[in-house]
């Protein structure tokens, strides 16, 4: 769902926190069209997925808290 | 205490549709996921999908869509699950389940089940 | 999809003894698995989360291990009230497909 670094739209899986090692946010005022959290996996891929549903903003809040504590 | 009441049974007719209830009690119904699960006779477990109460949001089974639509009315705290275009195959308990995060997308209370069998 | 695989289907032992019931998955799920008993008769209640934590009200007896692709579920010291049906489910990505289940009982 990414092109030339910009999401066109996002996955339809719900991934585990496990799974994820970071995530970049794009925003569609910079360029892309849609607003999209870009996950990024242990298997060196990228995820593109919805800011809005609630398992995002759990992964991203997990995921800001981990490194405010580094 | 957290509960997940569901009917015990429905009989329903080949080709009918059914709409099964699951009303949740006793925890902040849109703060967690709620998962539908099929188990037929003697077979193992089937996950069908999930809702997320706070946002409708859903996910199916790629095996289920067409087949199961999940619903939710936030008012009643109840969730639903709507089977369509009913055969043999779809006799089975359906159970409701709470996924929650804090214990690693688990489900950690379930309904009862409701006991579909389809037949003429 | 992840395929489950576990084994064995089904299992015999004796009150006392110490069993275990192992779950492959298709690739690597990172630990992102769970454990389920089921009783005749009954809904089934979430035994073992995230792979070695132990769920609330289930006894310490029942223990998990394992990472990557293989997993494991140990119960010791067996008691006749274990008699169930266990599935193990991996919830790294949807569709969160189930294990086919071992079925215990006691010699």
């Known amino acids: 769902a990414s092109n030339f670094d910009c999401c066109l739209g996002y996955t339809d899986r719900i991934l585990h926190p496990k799974f994820i090692v970071g995530f970049t946010r794009q925003l569609a005022n910079e360029g892309c069209d849609i607003n999209a959290i870009i996950f990024h996996t242990k298997k060196k891929l990228s995820v593109c997925a919805n800011p809005k549903q609630t398992w995002v903003k759990y992964i991203v809040r997990l995921l800001s808290k981990k490194v405010k504590n580094m | 205490q957290v509960q997940l009441q569901q009917p015990g049974a429905e009989l329903v007719k080949p080709g009918a549709s059914v709409k099964m209830s699951c009303k949740a009690s006793?925890?902040?119904?849109?703060?967690?996921?709620m998962h539908w699960v099929k188990q037929r006779p003697g077979q193992g477990l089937e996950w069908i999908g999930l809702?997320?109460?706070?946002?409708?949001?859903?996910n199916y089974n790629q095996k289920f869509k067409g087949k199961a639509t999940l619903t939710v009315d936030t008012s009643s705290s109840t969730a639903y699950m709507q089977l369509s275009s009913l055969t043999s195959e779809d006799s089975a308990v359906y159970y409701c389940?709470?996924?929650?995060?804090?214990?690693?997308?688990?489900?950690?209370?379930w309904g009862q089940g409701t006991s579909v069998t389809v037949s003429s | 999809d992840i395929q489950m695989t576990q084994s064995p289907a089904s299992l015999s032992a004796s009150v006392g003894e110490t069993v275990t019931i192992t779950c492959g998955a298709s690739?690597?799920?990172?630990?992102?698995l769970n454990w389920y008993q089921r009783k005749q008769g009954k809904s089934p209640q979430l035994l073992i989360y995230?792979?070695?934590n132990l769920a609330d009200g289930m006894s310490s007896r029942f223990s998990g291990s394992g990472s990557g692709r293989q997993y494991s579920l140990k119960i010791s010291s067996l008691h006749p009230d274990d008699v169930a049906t266990y599935y193990c489910?991996?919830?790294?990505?949807?569709?969160?497909?189930f294990g086919g289940g071992t079925k215990l009982e006691i010699k």
């Open positions: 006793g925890y902040t119904f849109t703060s967690y996921w």
């Open positions: 995230g792979a070695t």
């Open positions: 690739e690597n799920i990172y630990g992102a």
């Open positions: 389940t709470r996924g929650n995060y804090g214990v690693d997308y688990g489900m950690d209370y």
């Open positions: 489910q991996n919830v790294l990505s949807t569709p969160y497909t």
């Open positions: 809702i997320d109460p706070s946002d409708k949001y859903t």
